[in-house]
């Protein structure tokens, strides 16, 4: 266990030209509040996942009203840290969001207004009990100087806040396999509290709090003998001592959510998903207003009407949850139509359309043949948001440009020889056969199974297909 | 629009039972912890008992007034809200309202329930 | 048993502003009390005006505010319409049971 602590050094325009507008003005005084929220590992998942590692809210600034004419100066902070406890083990990564919030103080009907000024977020490497870190983030024209440092609380020590100390028992040396606990060389490492009840004999702990299952053992406390009768379908491996492995405590088991919370299992651990008015790692933090700027993502929250709609966040375009805390998946709605592609830019949704569709959803089926024209006395013929042209004898190509080789496809049957022609192909049957492609054979009397051949025409002579 | 409709209002003679339905549409019935309020003739409104949600593992709350005598209960794949009066008393008569609270207060438009001999 | 007080009967006029009030009998109303505010018009027509202090309901004209003045809940209605006369009913919630004070008969002359 132990406490982030983030002291914001100031928040004015940073560097640069373009420095923004101040927030407050004479008719519309302000003050400043800040709101932290932090997640374990170096996750991507800035924005939209729940703040698992904590989140906390700074007090209000003092007022500040602007002075006309004059640029925006660093604007007055709150006093004080803010400090994210958390109760267990500190990751060492973390990301962080710090929100730099505006009230205004004006003659608002129904009290003052809340708006989101600034959000910056990164991802840090942080040891439990060094020094503090200073980081400058910049967000549009605005600057935030702040440091941060994670501390344990006592009796936790190390760097991730896991290992326990208690003062010396004898003045000279420590208990049986357990060293002096640097930097306090007074103290001693104390052996590791596991979970309350945790079987001594059958159950052990890496973490505090945790109870681990000695093999054959089972239960959140590591009391319940491993099942050894015979398996119907067994759940993990089986050996004559043990029998058949039913299957050990699952983080969910006994719901850690506090407050009517929802425990679903992730790989490494559990998730709550909080109702209303509660958030925390486990829903244990309550008693959540809009004045605690609850809402993420630039959600604009209003008071509810009664203790389970203690506040109510109107989420941006984009997000959703009970504090706007979920990214929405746009894209799996399947808005783009013909087969588009979609993709969502945050800000918006973008369609990649196939060719021959168009529009931002890809909803308008182009006229393919529009403004295409086929070359050569071809014809246009639409379909499947493409176009192809039927091109007239002896023309090929997409758009019948190309001169076609009538030959090509070896018309003329019985080996005869094919000639390429201005209006089409010829073929030159060999002895014995006749017609356009020499698909007749010629009987052995001299008379062939076609009418007579034309005058000036024997029988043998290359027959011209018209 | 949401929309809140009562019914199983009628005449039922004192110690005699009743039980009231709520339909609702047009809003996620199953987030909502759901209310019943009722209004004597020529009186003020009173408020008669509360049910949360599932997340809240359905508590139940009610008024001194109608303690272990009325049920709420709810069935969140109809979206239903009901109120079971048993033991019911003359001065059980008034109009009930189905209500749930979320950024505002919504109300049905009631179903009346006379308690006389 | 908390008890909500409210003024019995107030009388304004026509671009007149008034102030109805919401006082609880166990202390100063906080936001924590969830201030409701209901309009009842005759034939049992009840409309939700304000929902936690003062989340204005959507449809609600502008004149109607909810705020919270000393100790008490209080509903402002800037500028009265004659439609406005009718019978206001303040709400507050106590942890999970809801008290209601006894109405506001308004009266725009």
């Known amino acids: 266990a132990g406490v982030f602590e983030l002291q914001i050094h100031s928040f004015g325009p940073g560097p640069g030209p373009g420095a923004p507008r101040s927030p407050c003005s004479a008719r519309l005084p302000c003050r400043l509040f800040f709101r932290v929220c932090l997640k374990p590992g170096l996750s991507e998942e800035a924005a939209e996942s729940p703040c698992a590692l904590g989140a906390a809210l700074s007090a209000r600034g003092p007022v500040y009203t602007e002075q006309p004419g004059a640029p925006a100066p660093d604007l007055p902070l709150p006093d004080g840290l803010l400090q994210v406890p958390f109760r267990d083990a500190w990751p060492g990564t973390f990301s962080f969001i710090i929100e730099t919030w505006r009230e205004e103080l004006g003659d608002q009907i129904g009290g003052p207004a809340w708006s989101l000024l600034a959000r910056v977020a990164g991802r840090r490497r942080l040891a439990a009990g060094g020094p503090w870190a200073r980081d400058i983030q910049r967000a549009g024209a605005w600057e935030l100087r702040f440091s941060y440092r994670a501390r344990c609380e006592p009796p936790a020590v190390g760097t991730a806040c896991t290992r326990l100390c208690r003062p010396r028992s004898a003045p000279s040396r420590c208990g049986p396999g357990l060293r002096p606990c640097a930097p306090l060389e007074d103290e001693c490492e104390a052996p590791l509290v596991c979970r309350a009840g945790c079987s001594p004999e059958h159950g052990f702990c890496e973490q505090p709090g945790e109870c681990r299952c000695l093999e054959g053992w089972t239960g959140p406390l590591c009391t319940v003998p491993v099942s050894t009768s015979s398996c119907l379908s067994p759940r993990g491996p089986s050996s004559a001592t043990t029998g058949c492995l039913v299957p050990g405590p699952g983080p969910c088991d006994g719901n850690p959510c506090a407050n009517g919370g929802s425990c679903s299992e992730t790989p490494r651990s559990f998730e709550c998903t909080c109702p209303r008015g509660f958030y925390g790692l486990r829903c244990e933090v309550s008693g959540v207003t809009c004045a605690d700027g609850p809402c993420f993502n630039g959600g604009l929250c209003v008071g509810g009407a009664d203790p389970d709609s203690a506040y109510i966040c109107h989420c941006p375009p984009g997000f959703q949850g009970s504090n706007c805390e979920k990214r929405v998946d746009r894209c799996s709605l399947q808005p783009c139509r013909n087969g588009g592609l979609c993709l969502d830019l945050g800000h918006a949704l973008r369609c990649r359309c196939r060719a021959g569709f168009a529009g931002p959803r890809c909803e308008h089926d182009l006229d393919d043949c529009a403004g295409r024209a086929c070359a050569n006395g071809g014809t246009c013929v639409e379909g499947g948001g493409a176009h192809r042209c039927s091109c007239a004898l002896g023309f090929g190509g997409r758009d019948c440009r190309e001169r076609a080789d009538p030959c090509a496809a070896r018309p003329c049957a019985h080996g005869g020889r094919c000639y390429a022609h201005f209006s089409g192909l010829v073929c030159a049957c060999a002895p014995g056969y006749m017609g356009a492609r020499c698909e007749f054979p010629v009987h052995p009397d001299g008379a062939s199974a076609l009418p007579a051949a034309p005058p000036g025409l024997r029988p043998g002579d290359p027959q011209r297909y018209l | 629009e949401v929309q809140l409709v009562e019914t199983g209002g009628g005449l039922v003679q004192p110690k005699g039972s009743l039980k009231l339905s709520c339909a609702v549409s047009?809003?996620?019935?199953?987030?909502?912890?759901m209310n019943w309020v009722r209004q004597a003739p020529g009186k003020g409104l009173e408020w008669v008992a509360r049910?949360?949600?599932?997340?809240?593992?359905?508590?139940?709350y009610y008024a001194d007034s109608v303690k272990d005598r009325f049920t709420i209960s709810r069935d969140d794949s109809q979206s239903m809200l009901y109120l079971q009066m048993n033991n019911l008393k003359i001065e059980d008569t008034a109009m009930y309202y189905c209500?749930?609270?979320?950024?505002?207060?919504?109300w049905g438009q009631g179903t009346l329930v006379t308690v006389s001999a | 048993q908390a008890v909500v007080t409210q003024e019995s009967a107030l009388t304004t006029s026509p671009g007149e502003t008034v102030t109805l009030t919401c006082r609880s009998s166990?202390?100063?109303?906080?936001?924590?009390?969830?201030a409701n505010w209901i309009q009842e018009k005759p034939d049992h027509l009840f409309t939700g005006l304000i929902g936690g202090t003062n989340n204005r309901a959507p449809g609600v004209p502008a004149r109607f505010s909810g705020s919270l003045i000393g100790d008490k809940a209080a509903l402002t209605i800037t500028g009265a319409q004659t439609e406005d006369e009718a019978i206001y009913f303040c709400g507050l919630w106590y942890s999970n049971h809801l008290v209601f004070g006894g109405g506001t008969k308004l009266t725009v002359l």
């Open positions: 209500v749930f609270h979320y950024d505002y207060v919504y």
């Open positions: 047009a809003f996620t019935f199953t987030t909502y912890a």
């Open positions: 166990t202390g100063a109303v906080t936001t924590s009390n969830y």
């Open positions: 049910i949360r949600n599932k997340s809240n593992n359905y508590a139940t």
